[in-house]
């Protein structure tokens, strides 16, 4: 392994995100060599850092069903991180999924 | 056919408690967040709580917190509510909803409370 | 603690248009939705994430939301649009919300 832990998120933000700024997110799972599992919000202004989040907490499943019904412009990205550089925190990544849907809108 | 069916609302005294459940049918249980909302006699909604999918997370509204405790059981798919120290201003009928992003996309048909001595 | 204002009433003539007002600090930076409910009935979503229509809803009903108010509005009003509706929203703490109400008469 080339560093395991360091591409990973290791703790989730106090913060929370308000779900008009988000456009998309993508999974952190322990099975792919993360510590934790982690969720990791996407802001629309690429200059700001993705929020890392706790999968079992209410906010947080709300904000990804609604990501998951909502319909976006772009084709989904292929893999992690592909569309953007290594972000300043040097974290590559690794061990995650990318849930930018753009099929399938789950509305009512 | 997706349903929810509120059930254990009746007459309580003042400082009592009542526990109602909601059975929930014909959608993935744990695969939705769910709410009580509550409807006092000619009034309006009122949000009560909600809970995330596998019951880690909840919120309340602050009329109720200390008193109300959501629960669900997966299992059973079964939603709960405990209501304790019950007060005349919680009359009203209960209703159970889901809950998908931010809105309620299914309602039960609510079930009655009424605290009265 | 947030809240959401409503207008008590609105009336509108048979076949013309209705716009239902909820009003709530920066509402606008989160999703609202809107419910129907008819006397004896529990309520029926009619609008969510600010102007989606569910499947089954009349294209007569849409929505809108910025700044400090959500917008109901119902074109072609008819009789059976009579009803009691609320308005309601998230915050970031998934904490929820609902509007006192508003009664639609429709005239004629």
């Known amino acids: 392994s080339d560093g395991g832990a360091q591409d990973c998120c290791l703790k989730y933000s106090q913060r929370k995100i308000p779900a008009k700024v988000v456009r998309s997110y993508r999974k952190q799972e322990p099975s792919l060599g993360c510590s934790i599992p982690a969720i990791l919000f996407l802001p629309r202004k690429r200059s700001q850092a993705e929020l890392c989040a706790d999968p079992k907490e209410l906010w947080v499943q709300q904000l990804m069903q609604h990501l998951d019904k909502t319909p976006t412009p772009r084709k989904p990205v292929q893999g992690c991180r592909k569309d953007r550089g290594v972000p300043k925190n040097g974290k590559k990544g690794k061990g995650c999924k990318r849930t930018e849907q753009s099929q399938t809108p789950k509305g009512p | 056919e997706v349903q929810l069916l509120e059930s254990g609302g009746g007459l309580v005294q003042p400082g009592g408690s009542l526990r109602l459940s909601c059975a929930a049918s014909?959608?993935?249980?744990?695969?939705?967040?769910m709410s009580w909302v509550r409807q006092a006699p000619g009034k309006g909604l009122e949000w009560v709580s909600a809970i995330s999918m596998e019951g880690y997370s909840k919120s309340y509204a602050d009329s109720v917190k200390g008193r109300f405790t959501i629960s669900r059981d997966n299992s059973k798919n079964t939603l709960y509510l405990q209501m304790n120290s019950l007060r005349a201003e919680d009359t009203a009928v209960y209703y159970c909803a889901r809950g998908y992003g931010y809105y309620f996309d299914v309602w039960g048909q609510g079930t009655l409370v009424t605290v009265s001595s | 603690s947030y809240e959401l204002t409503q207008p008590l009433s609105v009336s509108v003539a048979l076949g013309q248009t209705a716009r239902i007002t909820c009003g709530g600090d920066s509402i606008g930076s989160q999703y609202a939705s809107w419910y129907q409910q008819k006397p004896g009935q529990a309520p029926v979503l009619v609008i969510y994430?600010?102007?989606e229509r569910p499947s089954g809803i009349p294209e007569r009903f849409s929505g809108s939301n910025s700044g400090n108010t959500a917008t109901l509005t119902i074109s072609r009003a008819q009789a059976g649009d009579e009803a009691d509706y609320y308005c309601?929203?998230?915050?970031?703490?998934?904490?929820?919300?609902f509007g006192g109400g508003t009664k639609l008469t429709v005239l004629g």
């Open positions: 309601s929203s998230w915050d970031m703490d998934a904490v929820n919300v």
């Open positions: 994430d600010d102007n």
């Open positions: 014909g959608f993935t249980f744990n695969s939705y967040s």
